[in-house]
Structure formats: structure tokens, C-alpha cells
């Protein structure tokens, strides 16, 4: 028989982690493996049909994506949809596929809303999702004794798909669910310095444990301004939510692992400011299969898609599409073996959920709602040389914080700052006021 996979991803724009130039080679590798393995869909042919999720400008579109999905549905009657990755593109497509009872498989669509499976029935996320970041942060807070207050700042950049809004939304909601904690959130425009100044005035009254989602340059600017304002690492800790580790990469921008460095005359101050900074990224898979997969992926991307893939955490997305597709095909194979059909979306999806799978990204666990358990890394500066390195990983499956290579977190005072200042944010602690009174008497 024939099994049709309908792809709805950006076909022209290569900048998205889920661009077809990146995911296409991963799909090819997965399908080559299906052909090579007699236990997967014996006697079946798998073919892909493509639709674009981007508009004429090459930007993800909540109009183009559902139109492409509808066209693919009526023209090819696919057994499964692969993608979209962008939040606004995935939302309408996911609602349509739920109505059609056709599985949707993606390694994108990380926003909180896609976890609501009565609306997004049969949507399986084989990639990371933002609510899972909240699980990590909640575990971190418990361990460090921060169970009262946190502040989240997120940058707005025109045309960036509101990436930071969705990231902080998932983090915010999950942390509040997991801990009985007060969480404030503030938005700022990256290109408006007056916003930064306003943030710095607000910060001391709102939090000491601060999460920031922004570009690496905006984060560095904020850290420099915080240093100037005296918001230093003895009392504050700033977590950069840099999930793909952009700030830690070399190339055109900062030197590898030195996110404070620009060679612009402010590096000395920036290094000092970054003593108060930690960086949260997705965890880079360290299993040998992943490294081998990357080699093949890059080769295929160049040969068949005329695309040069850079190194970095973005490659975990095509790798997750690869693993997700293999998991789907495994589920179809099992469904057929039990007398089902390839159009039995519910049955196939149920076989994917609440299941573990050994893929190129390592041990992959899809939870009972069809979302992948996600691993994260926490990076911190080595005070000796100013380089950032992974100090601990979070294992999403076991929900454990895993200490790495004898390293420890760097706290300027030797211990983590409390999440609420000793006298409260507005010196409201009566004991502190008593002290002031006694000095006046």
C-alpha cells in the first residue's frame, strides 16, 4: 500500500529551525531507514507531498499554512501531516487536522496552547515545548529554595513570530502551576532603549530571580545597564532564555562560549555583569548516533537541498522530526499488525503517546498528552576564564537535575541570592523598619 505524508513547512525560507531545507534531509534519512528495515511497514511505500507554510515574503503565515493543508488534504488524502513548526501557522492547521481526525506530527509548535488536546486532538510534538521549560525552572526553584517570587521579561521584535511571548507564556503558566509562587512578567521592545531604562527601574521592586527572553545583543545591553544601575550578582540572578544557544556560538557574532564578548570596548564591564548571568538552552544530545546522524544530515542537505547546515542546537529540530516520523511509522506498523488501517488516526496516535523510543536524539519519551519530555542545559560562567559551560542538565523524563563534570554554579557571594530581599521589595518587613526607627530614636 501507499502511505502519504503531507508536509506543511517553510519551503523557501531556510532560517527557521523547521525549514524544509533542514527537515527534508531528516525525512529522507528516516524514510531510507524504513526501506532498510523489514520490520517497518513491510510492503508499503511512503511518499511525501509538500505544501508551504510561508507567504510570498517567505514568512510563516496563518493564512498560507491552513490553505496548503486543505489543498493537500483534498488532493492527496494524506495519512499524516508533518509540521507546521511556527506557532501561528500550526494553530489553524492543527484545528483542521483534529476535525479531519488525521494525525499531525511536528517538532515545532512549542507554545502552551498545543498542549490542550481537546482542541489539538491527534497532535504529537516530537520536539521541545515551552511548558516543559517550566518543569525545569520549577525543579531549579525547588532546589535553590526560590519558592516565592520570580520576574520574567520578554522582548518584542517586529516580525519574530512573538517567539519570546510564547516562550514566557509556557514558562509562566507551568511555573505557577508547579509552585505556589508569584510571577510577574513584563514586555519590552528590543529596539527601544527607553524600555530598558523603565525595566531597570521596575526590576528592584519586582524580583531578584529574573528570566529574560531576548536576542543575545539585547540581553548583553540589559546586563550592562543592570551593572551600571548596581543590580549586581550578589543580589540578583539573570537567566537568559536562549534555548537554541545563539549567544554561545562563534561565527559572525560572539566568540564561542563567551556571550559577553564583542570587542567593542565594553567587554570588561560585560564580563563583570555576566557574573550574575546564567543561560538556559535545550540540551545538545551527546549520544554517538546523533553525531553520526548530523554528519549524514549535513551531507544530504548540501547534496540534495543545496543548503549548508551550520552547527548548533537548531539541528535538534530536524533530528526530532526524524525520530518523530520513525515513531509514527512504528505506530502505523503496529496498528496494521493489529488489523487497523493507516487512516485510523486515533489508534495510531494512541500508540505514539505515553511511549519511549530510542532515536538519533537519544532516549525520547512522549508523555500521555503527546508531548515530548524535553531536556535542558544550564550554562554558567567559569569565574577563572570567563567562559560559559554546562553546569547541569535537566532530564525531562526523570524530572531530575543532573550535575555535570564536577562543575558547580558560580554565585558571587558563594550561595544563591534569595528570591525576596531580606527586608522585602519595599522594605516592608517590620523587623527592618524597627531597625531604622531605633537608629532615629
Amino acid at each position: 500500500g501507499n502511505l502519504t505524508v503531507a508536509v506543511v513547512l517553510p519551503l523557501a525560507n531556510t532560517s527557521y529551525p523547521w525549514s524544509w531545507a533542514r527537515v527534508g534531509p531528516a525525512v529522507e534519512l528516516a524514510l531510507a531507514q524504513v526501506k532498510a528495515r523489514p520490520d517497518l511497514l513491510p510492503g508499503w511505500t511512503v511518499r511525501t507531498v509538500l505544501g508551504s507554510s510561508e507567504n510570498a515574503l517567505g514568512v510563516c503565515s496563518d493564512t498560507a499554512a491552513p490553505l496548503a493543508a486543505v489543498d493537500l488534504k483534498w488532493e492527496h488524502n494524506p495519512a499524516v501531516f508533518l509540521g507546521p513548526g511556527c506557532v501561528y501557522a500550526a494553530a489553524p492547521v492543527g484545528r483542521f487536522t483534529a476535525h479531519w481526525r488525521v494525525p499531525l506530527l511536528t517538532a515545532g509548535a512549542p507554545a502552551l496552547g498545543f498542549g490542550v488536546k481537546d482542541e489539538y486532538a491527534l497532535t504529537t510534538r516530537a520536539g521541545p515545548s515551552y511548558a516543559k521549560l517550566g518543569d525545569f525552572v520549577a525543579a531549579l526553584h525547588r532546589r535553590l529554595g526560590w519558592e516565592r517570587q520570580a520576574l520574567m521579561l520578554y522582548a518584542y521584535r517586529p516580525g519574530d513570530e512573538e517567539h519570546c511571548f510564547f516562550l514566557v507564556e509556557g514558562l509562566f503558566m507551568r511555573v505557577r502551576d508547579r509552585l505556589n509562587i508569584t510571577v510577574d512578567h513584563l514586555e519590552f521592545a528590543e529596539d527601544d532603549l527607553s524600555h530598558y531604562t523603565r525595566l531597570l527601574r521596575t526590576m528592584p521592586r519586582k524580583g531578584r530571580v529574573i528570566y529574560i527572553c531576548s536576542s543575545p545583543d539585547a540581553f548583553r545591553t540589559l546586563m550592562l545597564l543592570a551593572l551600571e544601575a548596581g543590580l549586581c550578582g550578589e543580589d540578583y540572578v539573570f537567566f537568559h532564555l536562549d534555548i537554541f544557544g545563539q549567544s554561545l556560538q562563534g561565527g559572525q557574532g560572539p566568540a564561542p562560549r563567551r556571550p559577553w564578548e564583542r570587542g567593542d570596548g565594553q567587554d570588561v564591564s560585560a564580563r563583570q555583569a555576566f557574573q550574575a548571568a546564567k543561560i538556559i538552552t535545550y540540551k545538545d544530545p551527546d549520544n554517538p548516533e546523533y553525531l553520526e546522524f548530523l554528519k549524514q544530515l549535513k551531507h544530504l542537505a548540501y547534496e540534495q537541498f543545496n543548503f549548508t547546515m551550520e552547527d548548533g542546537l537548531v539541528n535538534t529540530i530536524p533530528a526530532s522530526f526524524h525520530d518523530g516520523l520513525l515513531l509514527y511509522i512504528q505506530a502505523v506498523t503496529e496498528t496494521l499488525a493489529h488489523g487497523g488501517t493507516v487512516t485510523d488516526g486515533e489508534n495510531i496516535t494512541q500508540r505514539m503517546w505515553n511511549r519511549s523510543f530510542q532515536g538519533v536524539t537519544g532516549y525520547l519519551k512522549i508523555d500521555s498528552s503527546g508531548d515530548r519530555e524535553t531536556d535542558f542545559s544550564l550554562w554558567d560562567m567559569d569565574p577563572e576564564n570567563g567562559a560559559f559551560r554546562v553546569v547541569l542538565n535537566y532530564n525531562g523524563t526523570s524530572q531530575e537535575l543532573v550535575a555535570v563534570s564536577g562543575r558547580k554554579l558560580n554565585w558571587p557571594l558563594g550561595y544563591p541570592p534569595p528570591d525576596i530581599p531580606k527586608c522585602g521589595f519595599d522594605n516592608e518587613d517590620p523587623a527592618c523598619n524597627q531597625d531604622h526607627l531605633s537608629t532615629l530614636e
Epitope: 531549579l140 529554595g145 531530575e400 537535575l401 543532573v402 558563594g414 550561595y415
Partner: antibody, heavy 120, light 107 residues
Framework: QVQLVQSGAEVKKPGASVKVSCKAS????????IHWVRQAPGQGLEWMGI????????SYAQNFQGRVTMTRDTSTNTVYMDLSSLRSEDTAMFYC?????????????WGQGTLVTVSS | AIQMTQSPSSLSASVGDRVTITCRAS??????LGWFQQKPGKAPKLLIH???SLQSGVPSRFSGSGSGTDFTLTISSLQPEDFATYYC?????????FGQGTKLEIK
């Protein structure tokens, strides 16, 4: 509650090896490091080395380099310290202790100690 | 390796006395220093971490201070159960190193 339980006392001949175990319970094994400390009779504390249970990373004090090997078994939450080429000066109490790399609290819980006697 | 020099090596004092023990590092270790108490036949017990943070369950008569290279452990009013040997430990980098210990005896 957090516990580190060490193996029993050992008597060894010079030149032999000893393997002391330290079984952890009451906390997430891979979230903390385990250190080993030696204390000869009537002497002070001497840091021997550290092992990271998650990845097996080790760092040893110069004094013990080449003679000590620290390993772990994550299936049983146990860390082992192997000291080879024993000499009489190695007669000592050996302690394992836990270290939190997040809050950076050093050696907050200790094992009860294992006495190793080296004698011909 | 960082050397830790503890002084005095022994000290006689009476119940109720205020006692101070010092520890000097051969290079700056920021606040990365702990103080331990050890009684005969027992494992050491952590009193102070990060130079001045009292470990939970430790009486408030114990306090620590200092940063960089010079550190102090103070017992404000000695109790009978405080007679023991005290050690400092630098946990700034590997290899960790202990001071040679201060034996606190009853006068």
C-alpha cells in the same frame, strides 16, 4: 532522609588494594557529587577526590594520583573508592561525603567512615 | 593547589568564652569556604558554608566571616559540647583542601 552508608572495616597487606563502597539514599543520586576524605589516626582531614555520579567525571588530589580510582553504579546509587599499592601509612578512616553543586554547599552529609588497616 | 593555613593548631578555653579560629588561603577563594566540627570517633559535621552561611540545625552561637584569603570562625559563648576539632575547607576549585585543624580543649 539523606544517608550515606559505607562498607565495613578492612584489613589489608601492604601492596594490596582496597575497595570501599558508599551507598547513597534519600536524594537524587545524579544531582550531587561524592567526595572522599582520608583521616589517618590522630591526624587531620585529607581530601582525596571527587566523582560526579551522572557522568563518572573524577578529579583526584595529587597525593593519590595513580593509586586511587573512583567509580559509580547508578543502578544501585553506589560510589566506590579503590586504593591500590597500599602501604602502612594508608591505615586510616576513609569517609565519603556529598556536595551540592547548585547551592554550592560543601560536604553537607558524610558517611560513617570505613577503617582500613594496612598491616603485614 | 591552594594551601589552607589554620591557626591556632590548639586552643584552651572555658565554657562561656568567646573563641575565634582563623583560616588563611594561599590565594583568593572568594566566599568558597566551609567550617567543620569533628568529635573523636565521629564523622565531621558541616557548620558553616559559603564563609558565613550557617548550616541548618547548627546553633547560632557559631558564625563565620571573611572573603578572599582571610576567614574566621567564631563561637560566641562556648558550650560543653563545642569542645572538638575544627577544620576549614576551601571548595573554590579542585583539589579541595582542608586546613590542618584546630583542637579546642577545656581549660
Amino acid at each position: 532522609q539523606v544517608q550515606l552508608v559505607q562498607s565495613g572495616a578492612e584489613v589489608k597487606k601492604p601492596g594490596a588494594s582496597v575497595k570501599v563502597s558508599c551507598k547513597a539514599s534519600g536524594y537524587t543520586f545524579t544531582s550531587y557529587y561524592i567526595h572522599w576524605v582520608r583521616q589517618a589516626p590522630g591526624q587531620g582531614l585529607e581530601w582525596m577526590g571527587i566523582i560526579s555520579p551522572s557522568d563518572g567525571y573524577t578529579s583526584y588530589a595529587q597525593n593519590f594520583q595513580g593509586r586511587v580510582t573512583m567509580t559509580r553504579d547508578t543502578s544501585t546509587n553506589t560510589v566506590y573508592m579503590d586504593l591500590s599499592s597500599l602501604r602502612s601509612e594508608d591505615t586510616a578512616m576513609f569517609y565519603c561525603a556529598r556536595n551540592d553543586p547548585l547551592t554550592t554547599v560543601a560536604l553537607d552529609y558524610w558517611g560513617q567512615g570505613t577503617l582500613v588497616t594496612v598491616s603485614s | 593547589a591552594i594551601q589552607m593555613t589554620q591557626s591556632p593548631s590548639s586552643l584552651s578555653a572555658s565554657v562561656g568564652d568567646r573563641v575565634t579560629i582563623t583560616c588563611r588561603a594561599s590565594q583568593g577563594i572568594r566566599y568558597d569556604l566551609g567550617w567543620f566540627q569533628q568529635k573523636p570517633g565521629k564523622a565531621p559535621k558541616l557548620l558553616i558554608h559559603a564563609a558565613s552561611s550557617l548550616q541548618s540545625g547548627v546553633p547560632s552561637r557559631f558564625s563565620g566571616s571573611g572573603s578572599g584569603t582571610d576567614f574566621t570562625l567564631t563561637i560566641s559563648s562556648l558550650q560543653p559540647e563545642d569542645f572538638a576539632t575544627y577544620y576549614c575547607l576551601q571548595d573554590y576549585n579542585y583539589p579541595f583542601t582542608f586546613g590542618q585543624g584546630t583542637k579546642l580543649e577545656i581549660k
